[in-house]
């Protein structure tokens, strides 16, 4: 969480951003809130990016003002116009690109004053893993697949019964470049699995951590997966 303040005394307003990550090819949100003002026509929101000459986005007098917008963001940005009056200056970024990563500044002017806060935006690819029993294999084998990751993640297997065990010797992980030549498909195979045990396939890079669990018993198979973004710090 990053909290920024304006220049001095009563002419400062609090602006708060949250560091976040964007999944390339999908839409992302750059989060920014500020002390709300009841005078909508006085509110100005400017999004800037370090190293970029033009503006990322500008909202003033109740509408988008995009004459100064940088070419790389053309047609890809929007604020939640109906939420500006309650202090939401968050930016929706369409079709996130790898090059969108960097330091952004959310700069706010209201009738009460000015304020700004920086936001670190990371970009990459992350997806939920699915763990299945590989019936084609000669021994009891689990196969963990996740369609899109970047940068290349690490994959670690764990088991509920053998906690702390190192499965690197009995697992094999491969990374296959996807057609757009950036993201990769992750496939990890775990051999010699035992029945009545819960296994976890953990995939992690510096942006996200995802886990796929599978519980195999004689009568059923239960799966569960979840994904967590890392470094969601507020400013």
């Amino acid at each position: 969480l990053i909290i920024g303040f304006g220049i001095s005394g009563r002419h400062s307003i609090t602006v708060t951003t949250v560091a976040s990550a964007g999944n390339i090819g999908e839409d992302g949100i750059l989060s920014c809130t500020f002390e709300p003002d009841i005078k909508l026509s006085d509110i100005v929101i400017q999004w800037l990016k370090e190293g970029v000459l033009g503006l990322v986005h500008e909202f003033k007098e109740g509408k988008d003002e995009l004459s100064e917008q940088d070419e790389m963001f053309r047609g890809r940005t929007a604020v939640f116009a109906d939420q500006v009056i309650v202090g939401n200056a968050s930016l929706r970024l369409k079709n996130v690109q790898l090059t969108d990563a960097g330091t952004y500044k959310c700069y706010i002017i209201t009738s009460k004053g000015k304020g700004n806060a920086n936001l670190e935006y990371k970009t990459g690819a992350f997806s939920m893993p699915e763990v299945n029993v590989d019936y084609n294999a000669s021994s009891e084998t689990l196969r963990c697949e996740a369609p899109r990751w970047f940068p290349q993640p690490t994959v670690v297997w764990a088991s509920q019964v053998d906690q702390g065990a190192n499965f690197s010797e009995v697992s094999n992980t491969s990374f296959e470049l996807n057609s757009e030549n950036v993201t990769m498909k992750v496939v990890s195979v775990l051999y010699n699995v035992t029945i009545n045990n819960t296994y976890s396939c953990m995939i992690e890079n510096d942006i996200a951590k995802a886990t796929g669990d599978i519980k195999v018993t004689e009568s059923e198979i239960k799966r569960r997966s979840h994904l967590q973004l890392l470094n969601s710090k507020a400013s």
């Epitope: 002390e35 709300p36 009841i38 005078k39 909508l40 026509s41 006085d42 007098e61 109740g62 509408k63 116009a81 109906d82 939420q83 009056i85 309650v86 202090g87 009738s111 009460k112």
Partner: antibody
Framework: EVQLQQSGTVLARPGASVKMSCKAS????????MHWVKQRPGQGLEWIGA????????SYNQKFQGKAKLTAVTSASTAFMELTSLTNEDSAVYYC??????????WGQGTTLTVSS | EIQMTQSPSSMSASLGDTITITCQAT??????LNWYQQKPGKPPSFLIY???QLAEGVPSRFSGSGSGSDYSLTISNLDSEDFADYYC?????????FGGGTKLEIK
């Protein structure tokens, strides 16, 4: 659930002052503007003013400057409006209304003020 | 101060009808307009925000439209619950101002 609970009916003499309250629950009271709106019998709605409890910032409709005084006690999540030098024209229902997710999204049930000698 | 002219001030309609109420601002208010419904002895209730967006729990027979200085509220397939007073509110310029209201009565 957001709720705004206003104080009860008030009967006052001309020239007197009254203070009414609005207790908020269900959201962070200090972080959002609280507004007051006047409605005379059979008439429309008139914005009086607003207070931002976190900083005690106030904003008034020029028409009500000097007539209404807005205050808030954040620890009690309660906003107050004091009306001074009352006349018959001040007889009305007064509403508090929040700007939580949108402008005037939640309303109190209203406080009826009757000014009579 | 922006003036909001709401029309008609009163109207009558039958169950199942479609009606339209309009609000005209004295200047462009950039879609910063809400609609409220008020029943006798009750506070106004939040109906539509930012010209077109339905507030939570509001039936889809209510719709809002408009831009610039001209806005409208349409209620289709009128239900007995819909007979009430309606107000528009502009919050673009300070101070926020309401329209004069429309009383919708059953024919």
């Amino acid at each position: 659930e957001v709720q705004l609970q206003q104080s009860g009916t008030v009967l006052a003499r001309p020239g007197a002052s009254v203070k009414m309250s609005c207790k908020a629950s269900g959201y962070t009271f200090s972080s959002y503007w609280m507004h007051w709106v006047k409605q005379r019998p059979g008439q429309g709605l008139e914005w009086i003013g607003a207070i931002y409890p976190g900083k005690s910032d106030t904003s008034y409709n020029q028409k009500f400057q000097g007539k209404a005084k807005l205050t808030a006690v954040t620890s009690a999540s309660t906003a107050f409006m004091e009306l001074t030098s009352l006349t018959n024209e001040d007889s009305a229902v007064y509403y508090c209304t929040s700007t939580w997710t949108h402008y005037f999204d939640y309303w109190g049930q209203g406080t009826t003020l009757t000014v009579s000698s | 101060e922006i003036q909001m002219t709401q029309s008609p001030s009163s109207m009558s309609a039958s169950l199942g009808d479609t009606i339209t109420i309009t609000c005209q601002a004295t200047q462009d208010i950039v879609k910063s307009l809400n609609w409220y419904q008020q029943k006798p002895g009750k506070p106004p209730s939040f109906l539509i925000y930012y010209t077109t967006q339905l507030a939570e729990g509001v039936p889809s027979r209510f719709s809002g439209s408009g831009s610039g200085s001209d806005y409208s509220l349409t209620i289709s397939n009128l239900d007995s619950e819909d007979f009430a007073d309606y107000y528009c509110l502009q919050f673009y310029e300070f101070p926020p101002t309401f329209g004069g209201g429309t009383k919708l009565e059953i024919k």
